[in-house]
């Protein structure tokens, strides 16, 4: 399978497990979490950076806390620096992480899928029309 | 091939100790997480341990947590598994299994166990 | 925690049926946290779907996953004499089982 077959299953992934995580918000710390929304074009992987960065935990309530420390382990699992540096040229100007608007855990994730799935179309996207700027 | 073995299995009385080793090859072993799962006699599947690819960290099933403790080697592809403590109720067959999916970007990504061992017997009694 | 159920705890076909088998648990689950695994006597597990739907390496599309939330199904489209075994369902992350659903020949 081509690597950027790989790349696009891992994505995809990154969704079921917010989606996982979305089951148990009630067991998340009710933490607000700067959690980038309308990302401007070229600084997706810096917004997805600030995701990974943010301090999702689990309230330590007993139940499923097993499945959401996997969970949360997994969603912040790093790309290879190909990925996340294409936009390297872009980042300086790319907003930093303190600087997006705090959001509770239930709403934290929403964003995270929406710039999941925005970074999903954007590779498809790029690969139909043949660019190799994904 | 890739491969699991495991080791250290036997008959060991109420309140001792043992300790499982599960040889692996064939693969990066590094790069995966690890699992004990455990069947006793005539019953079901039963997840026993967990421990991240690096080591970084581990989940136990409630009916071990205190008693048993998962390891691994890196360096010698080895995995562990010393259990303390030991119960009449511990009695069963212990398989190591590999995590389905890699630490690696590109490498596999199967939310499940794909790779499992033969088996080791432990038999708890007086 | 979560708790699968399987049913039926038995199921006796005959080669060249179809098997539906039953896994439905207490609790959503996203797809990708869906396992199904093959047990014959004697010998370990081996993986035959992942991600509630993906067959893992080298298993026959006789097996095929299906399913969402809480209920999930793995169906063998044509017995056949290698099939009969027991089959458990499993939750990724918390790694809970199923109790198992034994297919037997009839």
């Known amino acids: 399978m081509q690597g950027q077959d790989r790349h696009m299953i891992r994505m995809r992934q990154l969704i079921d497990i917010v989606d996982q995580l979305k089951n148990y918000v009630n067991d998340l710390v009710p933490e607000f979490l700067p959690a980038p929304e309308d990302v401007e074009t070229n600084c997706e992987w810096s917004a997805f950076s600030c995701f990974q960065k943010a301090q999702l935990k689990s309230a330590n309530t007993g139940n499923n806390e097993r499945i959401i420390n996997v969970s949360i382990k997994k969603l912040k699992r790093k790309p290879p620096s190909t990925n996340a540096g294409r936009r390297q040229k872009h980042r300086l100007t790319c907003p930093s992480c303190d600087s997006y608007e705090k959001k509770p855990p239930k709403e934290f994730l929403e964003r995270f899928k929406s710039l999941l799935q925005k970074m999903i179309h954007q590779h498809l996207s790029s690969r139909t029309h043949g660019s190799e700027d994904s | 091939q890739v491969q699991l073995v495991e080791s250290g299995g036997g008959v060991v009385q109420p309140g001792r100790s043992l300790r499982l080793s599960c040889a692996a090859s064939?693969?990066?072993?590094?790069?995966?997480?690890m699992h004990w799962v455990r069947q006793a006699p005539g019953k079901g599947l039963e997840w026993v341990a967990f421990?991240?690819?690096?080591?970084?960290?581990?989940y136990y099933a409630d009916s071990v947590k205190g008693r048993f403790t998962i390891s691994r080697d890196n360096s010698k592809n080895t995995l562990y598994l010393q259990m303390n403590s030991l119960r009449a109720e511990d009695t069963a067959v212990y398989y190591c299994?590999?995590?389905?999916?890699?630490?690696?970007?590109?490498?596999?990504?199967?939310?499940?166990?794909?790779?499992w061992g033969q088996g080791t017997t432990v038999t708890v009694s007086s | 925690e979560i708790v699968l159920t399987q049913s039926p705890g038995t199921l006796s076909l005959s080669p060249g049926e179809r098997a539906t088998l039953s896994c439905r648990a207490s609790?959503?689950?996203?797809?990708?946290?869906l396992a199904w695994y093959q047990q014959k006597p004697g010998q370990a597990p081996r993986l035959l779907i992942y991600?509630?739907?993906s067959r893992a390496t080298g298993i026959p599309d006789r097996f095929s996953g299906s399913g969402s939330g809480t209920d999930f199904t793995l169906t063998i489209s044509r017995l056949e004499p290698e099939d009969f075994a027991v089959y458990y369902c499993q939750q990724y992350g918390s790694w809970t089982f199923g109790q198992g659903t034994k297919v037997e020949i009839k």
């Open positions: 991600g509630a739907t």
């Open positions: 609790q959503s689950v996203s797809s990708s946290y």
């Open positions: 299994a590999r995590d389905g999916d890699s630490s690696d970007w590109y490498g596999d990504y199967y939310f499940g166990m794909d790779v």
């Open positions: 064939g693969f990066t072993f590094s790069s995966y997480g």
């Open positions: 421990i991240w690819y690096d080591g970084s960290d581990k």
